[in-house]
């Protein structure tokens, strides 16, 4: 059974996936952002169902395409490289969702673009976490 | 409603110039990409070029790199295509269209090239 | 550089189902927009972001890709949807727009 201080050690690490998975939110729907609607035309695959941690997996899956595609706007849109933003969502990913576990994420029949994918992920981090609380 | 507006086109010879110009309304053109997009006679559609919104990116079809120009003009409303050196398969109908990916489109200005 | 492709021609009887191909490369990572032009008319929008219907196209109209393939169907297929139909994406970069070569669609 998940003790308190590793449900504790789980929510601090969703909090921050939230806080980087805005941060990129806001980062390319800004209005000063030239790239948005190119960017628009990437599509990102959403998960069937997301409701667990292990759900995750589909996410990592699909942090390489992310990075690609903020390649594309301008930096100073973000505190950081994407290279360095998208490492930074891996290795969170990677201890939520546990690395021994192998789970195979199935994908939904439905693409999204990138603030549809971003908004997802953001919504599975906020009903985690409040089921946490 | 949206609407765009084409004009200049016309019979020029081989080695010409033309400039087309597209007058746009109805929309807030400055927050969107234009494009043109030509079609030869019974053919099918060819993207031209396109612009973001303050003209600081511009990509263009190989077969028109170095000839053709695209610009607009945020204060007028207006998208230009400064087409030089033109050849005989530069003969086409061009439509002024709104968007990166494309919602809209005028009724387009016939360009013939021949001598 | 970059290719769309279509086949150039699809028949159905009114009431059928068409469907129209396009393959491209960049399709798995792209999204594909349709266009519908009809004889001496401009173009018209019927499909974008491979799924999505523009408001005021009829119901019949949809879209779905798998893989390098995207695919307008039109489901009962009338007398007036009879016309050319374009598919349209961009490169893996997003530099490159393209149009497919087109499909006439006759509905007999």
């Known amino acids: 059974a998940p003790t308190s201080s590793s449900t504790k050690k789980t929510q601090l690490q969703l909090e921050h996936l939230l806080l980087d998975l805005q941060m990129i939110l806001n980062g390319i729907n800004n209005y000063k952002n030239p790239k948005l609607t190119r960017m628009l035309t990437f599509k990102f695959y959403m998960p069937k169902k997301a409701t667990e941690l292990k759900h995750l997996q589909c996410l990592e899956e699909e942090l390489k395409p992310l990075e690609e595609v903020l390649n594309l706007a301008q930096s100073k849109n973000f505190h950081l490289r994407p290279r360095d933003l998208i490492s930074n969502i891996n290795v969170i990913v990677l201890e939520l969702k546990g690395s021994e576990t192998t789970f195979m994420c199935e994908y939904a029949d439905e693409t999204a673009t990138i603030v549809e994918f971003l908004n997802r992920w953001i919504t599975f981090c906020q009903s985690i976490i409040s089921t946490l609380t | 409603q949206v609407q765009l507006v084409e004009s200049g086109g016309g019979l020029v010879q081989p080695g010409g110039s033309l400039r087309l110009s597209c007058a746009a309304s109805?929309?807030?053109?400055?927050?969107?990409?234009m494009t043109w997009v030509r079609q030869a006679p019974g053919k099918g559609l060819e993207w031209v070029a396109n612009?973001?919104?303050?003209?600081?990116?511009?990509y263009y079809v190989d077969s028109v790199k170095g000839r053709f120009t695209i610009s607009r003009d945020n204060a007028k409303n207006s998208l230009y295509l400064q087409m030089n050196s033109l050849r005989a398969e530069d003969t086409a109908l061009y439509y002024c269209?709104?968007?990166?990916?494309?919602?809209?489109w005028g009724q387009g200005t016939t360009v013939t090239v021949s001598s | 550089s970059y290719e769309l492709t279509q086949p150039p021609s699809v028949s159905v009887s009114p009431g059928q189902t068409a469907r129209i191909t396009c393959s491209g490369d960049?399709?798995?990572?792209?999204?594909a927009y349709w266009y519908q032009q009809k004889s001496g008319q401009a173009p018209v929008m019927v499909i974008y972001?491979?799924?999505k219907r523009p408001p005021g196209i009829p119901e019949r109209f949809s879209g779905s890709s798998s893989g390098t393939m995207a695919t307008l169907t039109i489901t009962g297929a009338q007398v007036e949807d009879e016309a050319d139909y374009y598919c349209?994406?961009?490169?893996?970069?997003?530099?490159?727009?393209?149009f497919g070569g087109g499909t006439k669609l006759t509905v007999l």
């Open positions: 269209a709104r968007g990166y990916t494309i919602s809209d």
């Open positions: 109805g929309f807030s053109f400055s927050t969107h990409w």
């Open positions: 612009i973001n919104q303050d003209g600081g990116e511009k």
């Open positions: 960049a399709l798995p990572r792209k999204f």
């Open positions: 972001e491979d799924s």
């Open positions: 349209y994406s961009t490169d893996s970069g997003g530099d490159v727009s393209v």
